[in-house]
Interface confidence: low
C-alpha cells in the first residue's frame, strides 16, 4: 500500500501508543539504486530495528514516562556500504495511556488558620504529581476534600481548589470556626487523575491536620463614659489589636461630626480626647480599622460604641418665661387648671431629670393665701379652697418651684380669673346650602366661611369657639381655621378632593369653647351647621404605586431575563400603556399591558449602576394623558473584566551596562466591583522562557515587583509579559507587557543618537 | 416682659460683609440663641444656632462657610458675622431664644432688616 505503509526514504513523524505489543510494521522504505540496504541509527532503545530491505518496525512495546519522543536517522547505503541517501530523521511520538497513578508529595499535610479569616483565601496548598502527559486527561489532576473531622450539622468548613489544590475557608468557615470550641481538624484529600471524570481514573489520598488559631481582631465590649470628666485627657477607653504586631490603626467617623473626640495610637489604644457632654450627643459609634504598610486594609473594621453617662450638671427649665392659664369663676374644688411642664436635659427617667414642683408664693393673698396647690411630681395645678371670683382678683400670679435632686428653678405661672362658661356657641345658619367644586382643587384653598357666637367673655375660653368636622369627611381632606378675633370659621382643603371616592359629601360643623361648659348647660342643636360638597370630575392622569421602582440583578442576566416590574393605575379606571423613556443604551424593554420590564441586551454594571430610565403610563383612550416615574436597575457585580495595568507604563529604563540587578514596582486593576478589601492579584511570569531572566514578586494585593535576575543583558528593548489573575469567581487573567529598555545613560537619562528619536524610554530605574 | 433688641443690618453690597447683633433684658441659663430670616411672603427660615455654653454652633447649608455665629460680650447677648452676602440673603432677621434646638423657639426679637443689592 504505496503511500501509508511505504514509499521513498524522507524525514516522517509517527505516533504510537505506549505500552502496546508490537502488532504490525511501522513503514516499509523503498531503495532507489545504487541503494541496496539501509541503516538505523539515533535514539532506538534496542527497540527500533530495520531490516536491511528498509522495514522499520519495533520489538516491544514502547513507555512514553521513559522517552516520549525517539528521534531516529534512517540512511540508505550502496553495497559497499556507503551512504548514498539521507541520513533522514524520523521521529516516534508516543503517545500516552493512563498508566501511571498520582501520588501526593507528602503523605501528611500540616497547617495553621485563623478564625473569621476570609473566605477562598488559599492558607495551604496540597500537591500530587503524575508522570502521565499533563496535555491529556491522563495527567490532569482533580482534588477533592474526602471527609471534614470533625464535621458540625453536615456543614463544611473548608473547601478545595480542584484544580491548584488550595485550601480555604467557606463562608460558614470563616463565621463559626471557633478555637474554643474546636482547635483542629482533619481532612482527607484525594487527588484523581483524568480530570475526575472517569471511572477508570487513579487515584490517592493523604491527610491534612488544620490547626485553628484566635483572631484577635474583634470589636471591644460597648465602653460607658461619664460626661463631664475632670480627669486629664486624653483617658484610654478600650483596644483593639490585629493579629501581628506592625499594623498602622486608624479610627473613622461615619458620622462626620464637627468634632470627633476620639483618638487611636499605635498600640492599638482607643482613648477618648476631651470631655464629652451627654446633652450634645449620648452615643458614639466610630470604627477602628487595621492596615498594613503600604495602607491596605488588613480585615474589616471594627464597630466601637461608646456610651455617655449622665451626671445632674442641667437645672430645670421653665416651658417659657410665664405660663398662662384660665380658671372659670365657678369650678369646683379639685378642678384641673392646667399643668405645668418643666424640661430637664438631663437623661430621661432618672433621678437627675425626675422633677418635683413646689408652689411657693401666691400674688394677691386674697381671698387667702393657699387657694391652688399643684401635684408633686406631675406638676398639675388645681384649685385648692374654693371657687374664686372675677371681681375680687381678676388675676393671680404663682411662683412655683421645680427642683431635680441637685437643682432648683424658679417658674412663673398668670392664672386668670375667667367669666363662667354658660353660653353656647350658635351658628348663624344651620345649612349653608351646597357648593359645587372642581376635584383638582387647589389644597389650601378656603372654600367656605361659616360664622357662630358666643355671648360670654370675650377673648376668652369660654368664649373661643373652635370648629370640628363631625361627619361626612372621614378622609379629612377638609379643615376650619378659626379667626381668634372674629371666631369666624374658615373651610380649607387640606387633602386633594377626589371624585371617584366621595362625589357628595354631606359634612356637618359643631362648634365648641376650649373650656368646659357649667353644669347643666349643654351644646345642642344651635351649636351645629351643614353643608352639601359636590365634587366634579377632572380627568386625571394615571397614578404610578411608587416614586421609584427599584430591582436588583446580577448584570451577566441572560437576554429576555426579567428585571423587575412597575405598576400604575387610573383613577377613570381608564387602561395603560407602559413605555420607556431615556434608556440611552438600549438595554430595556417594557411590557405594554403588564408593565414588567426585560432586559434586551447584555447589561454591564461596570458601564454604570444603579442604571436608571424613567417609566411613562398613558391612558389608553380619554385624552392620553400620563405620568412619569422613575426605574431604577441595580447591577450586582460578577468578575467579567480581567486584570490589566493601572498605567501606561511605556518609558521604564535600565542603564546598560547593569552593575547590580536591578527593580521596578507596578500596579495592577481591574474594573469589577472590590469590597472592603480591595483587589487580591496574583502576579507570575507570562512565559517560562523569562525566569531565566526576569522574577516577579507580589508586595500587596494590587502591587507587585520585577526584578532582574542577573546583569548580563544586551542594549536594546525587552518586552516581559506578566500573568495576574483575579482570583475571583470565576478567576479571570489578564496577560500584560512590560516594555523594558536596558540603555546607554547620560546623567541618568537614556542617550540616543540624533535620528533614533522614536520611543526614547523617559523613566530610569 | 422680657424683650431681645437686634441692631446692625442695613443696605449692603453683594459680597460685602455685615454684623448682627442682640442682646436680651434677661440672661437665659441653659437656653440656646440664634437668628432666623423671613423673605416677603415666606415662613421663617432657620440660619444660626449658638449653644448656651458658647461650645458649639449650628448652621443651614445656605450660610454655612459665610456666617458665623458666636458669643457677644454677655452671656445674654449673640452675635451673627455674616460674610460674602448674596442677593438672596435678603430679608428680615430675627433674634431667638430656643431651648432644645432650631424647633422649638421661646421667644422671638423685633427683627432687623438686612438688603442685600448694589
Known amino acids: 500500500q504505496e503511500g501509508k505503509f511505504s514509499g521513498p526514504l524522507k524525514p516522517m513523524t509517527f505516533s504510537i501508543y505506549e505500552g502496546q505489543e508490537p502488532s504490525q510494521i511501522i513503514f516499509q522504505f523503498k531503495a532507489n539504486p545504487p541503494a541496496v540496504t539501509f541503516e538505523l541509527t539515533g535514539e532506538t532503545d534496542n527497540i527500533f530495528v530495520i531490516e536491511r530491505e528498509g522495514l522499520l518496525y519495533y520489538n516491544r512495546a514502547l513507555d512514553r514516562e521513559t522517552r516520549s519522543t525517539h528521534n531516529l536517522q534512517v540512511a540508505a547505503l550502496d553495497a559497499n556500504g556507503i551512504i548514498v541517501e539521507g541520513p533522514v530523521p524520523i521521529t516516534i511520538k508516543v503517545k500516552d495511556i493512563n498508566d501511571n497513578r498520582p501520588t501526593f508529595l507528602q503523605s501528611k499535610y500540616e497547617g495553621s488558620v485563623r478564625q473569621n479569616s476570609r473566605p477562598g483565601k488559599p492558607f495551604l496548598y496540597v500537591n500530587a504529581t503524575d508522570l502521565d502527559d499533563p496535555a491529556t486527561p491522563n495527567g490532569q489532576l482533580y482534588y477533592q476534600i474526602v471527609i471534614q473531622l470533625p464535621m458540625i450539622n453536615n456543614v463544611m468548613y473548608f473547601q478545595i481548589n480542584n484544580k491548584t489544590g488550595a485550601i480555604s475557608l467557606t463562608r460558614e468557615g470563616s463565621q463559626e470556626l471557633n478555637p474554643a470550641k474546636n482547635p483542629s481538624y482533619n481532612l482527607v484529600i484525594s487527588v484523581k487523575d483524568m480530570g475526575g471524570q472517569s471511572e477508570n481514573s487513579f487515584s490517592d489520598t493523604t491527610s491534612v491536620d488544620i490547626i485553628v488559631t484566635e483572631n484577635i481582631w474583634k470589636a471591644p465590649k460597648p465602653v460607658e463614659m461619664v460626661e463631664n470628666s475632670t480627669d486629664p485627657h486624653p483617658i484610654k477607653i478600650t483596644q483593639v489589636r490585629w493579629n501581628d504586631p506592625g499594623a498602622q490603626y486608624s479610627l473613622v467617623d461615619k458620622e462626620k461630626l464637627p468634632r470627633f473626640p476620639f483618638s487611636i495610637d499605635q498600640e492599638g489604644d482607643i482613648y477618648v480626647t476631651q470631655p464629652l457632654d451627654r446633652e450634645e450627643k449620648d452615643a458614639y459609634v466610630f470604627y477602628a480599622v487595621a492596615k498594613d504598610e503600604y495602607g491596605k486594609p488588613l480585615s474589616y473594621p471594627l464597630e466601637i460604641h461608646v456610651k455617655v453617662k449622665d451626671i445632674n450638671d442641667n437645672p430645670p427649665t421653665c416651658p417659657s418665661p410665664v405660663t398662662v392659664f384660665e380658671v372659670q369663676e365657678n369650678e369646683r374644688l379639685g378642678n384641673s387648671i392646667g399643668t405645668l411642664t418643666a424640661h430637664d436635659r438631663d437623661e430621661e427617667n432618672t433621678a437627675n431629670s425626675f422633677l418635683n414642683y413646689r408652689i411657693v408664693e401666691q400674688t394677691p393673698k386674697l381671698p387667702m393665701d393657699g387657694l391652688f396647690l399643684i401635684q408633686t411630681y406631675a406638676g398639675m395645678l388645681q384649685l385648692a379652697k374654693q371657687s374664686l371670683k372675677k371681681q375680687d382678683t381678676p388675676q393671680y400670679n404663682l411662683t412655683i418651684e421645680v427642683s431635680d435632686k441637685d437643682f432648683k428653678t424658679l417658674c412663673f405661672v398668670q392664672i386668670n380669673v375667667i367669666d363662667i362658661n354658660d353660653q353656647i356657641p350658635i351658628f348663624e345658619k344651620s345649612d349653608y346650602g351646597n357648593l359645587t367644586l372642581a376635584e383638582d382643587t387647589n389644597i389650601g384653598s378656603t372654600i367656605l366661611t361659616i360664622q357662630a357666637t358666643d355671648a360670654d367673655e370675650p377673648f376668652t375660653g369660654s368664649s373661643k369657639i373652635l370648629y370640628h368636622i363631625i361627619k361626612g369627611d372621614s378622609e379629612g381632606r377638609l379643615g376650619v381655621d378659626t379667626d381668634p378675633h372674629t371666631n369666624t370659621g374658615y373651610v380649607i382643603i387640606k387633602k386633594p378632593l377626589d371624585f371617584e371616592t366621595a362625589a357628595v359629601s354631606n359634612i356637618v360643623f359643631k362648634a365648641e369653647n376650649p373650656e368646659p361648659l357649667v353644669f347643666g348647660v349643654k351644646y345642642n342643636a344651635s351649636s351645629f351647621a351643614k353643608f352639601t360638597l359636590i365634587v366634579t370630575d377632572v380627568n386625571e392622569a394615571p397614578q404610578f404605586s411608587q416614586h421609584v421602582f427599584q430591582a436588583k440583578v446580577s448584570e451577566d442576566v441572560a437576554i429576555g431575563t426579567k428585571v423587575g416590574n412597575v405598576t400604575a393605575k387610573d383613577p377613570e379606571g381608564l387602561d395603560i400603556s407602559y413605555s420607556l423613556r431615556g434608556d440611552t443604551r438600549g438595554w430595556l424593554k417594557i411590557d405594554h399591558v403588564t408593565g414588567e420590564i426585560f432586559s434586551v441586551a447584555p447589561l454591564d454594571r461596570e458601564a454604570g449602576s444603579p442604571y436608571r430610565v424613567q417609566v411613562v403610563a398613558t391612558e389608553v383612550g380619554g385624552s392620553s394623558l400620563s405620568s412619569v416615574s422613575e426605574f431604577h436597575l441595580i447591577l450586582m457585580d460578577v468578575n467579567d473584566n480581567p486584570p490589566r495595568l493601572a498605567k501606561d507604563y511605556t518609558g521604564l529604563f535600565f542603564c546598560h551596562p547593569l552593575s547590580a540587578p536591578g527593580s521596578l514596582i507596578f500596579e495592577a486593576t481591574d474594573d469589577d466591583q472590590h469590597l472592603f478589601r480591595g483587589p487580591h492579584f496574583t502576579f507570575s511570569l507570562g512565559s517560562g522562557s523569562l525566569q531565566n531572566d526576569w522574577e516577579v514578586s507580589k508586595i500587596n494585593g494590587t502591587h507587585a515587583r520585577l526584578s532582574t535576575r542577573h546583569t548580563e543583558f544586551e542594549e536594546r528593548e525587552y518586552v516581559v509579559l506578566i500573568r495576574i489573575n483575579d482570583g475571583g469567581r470565576p478567576p479571570l487573567e489578564g496577560i500584560v507587557s512590560l516594555p523594558v529598555t536596558f540603555c546607554s545613560c547620560v546623567e541618568g537619562s537614556c542617550f540616543r543618537p540624533a535620528g533614533h528619536q522614536t520611543g526614547i524610554p523617559t523613566v530610569g530605574m | 416682659q422680657v424683650q431681645l433688641q437686634e441692631s446692625g443690618g442695613g443696605l449692603v453690597q453683594p459680597g460685602g460683609s455685615t454684623r448682627l447683633s442682640c442682646v436680651s433684658s434677661?440672661?437665659?441659663?441653659?437656653?440656646?440663641m440664634g437668628w432666623f430670616r423671613q423673605y416677603p411672603g415666606k415662613e421663617r427660615e432657620f440660619v444660626a444656632l449658638?449653644?448656651?455654653?458658647?461650645?458649639?454652633?449650628e448652621y443651614s447649608d445656605s450660610v454655612m462657610g459665610r456666617f458665623v455665629v458666636s458669643r457677644g460680650n454677655t452671656q445674654n447677648s449673640v452675635n451673627l458675622q455674616m460674610n460674602n452676602l448674596k442677593p438672596e440673603d435678603t430679608g428680615i432677621y430675627y433674634c431667638?431664644?430656643?431651648?432644645?434646638?432650631?424647633?422649638?423657639?421661646?421667644?422671638w426679637g423685633q427683627g432687623t432688616q438686612v438688603t442685600v443689592s448694589s
Open positions: 431667638a431664644v430656643t431651648y432644645g434646638g432650631a424647633r422649638s423657639v421661646r421667644l
Open positions: 449658638l449653644s448656651w455654653r458658647g461650645n458649639y454652633a
Open positions: 434677661r440672661t437665659f441659663s441653659y437656653y440656646d
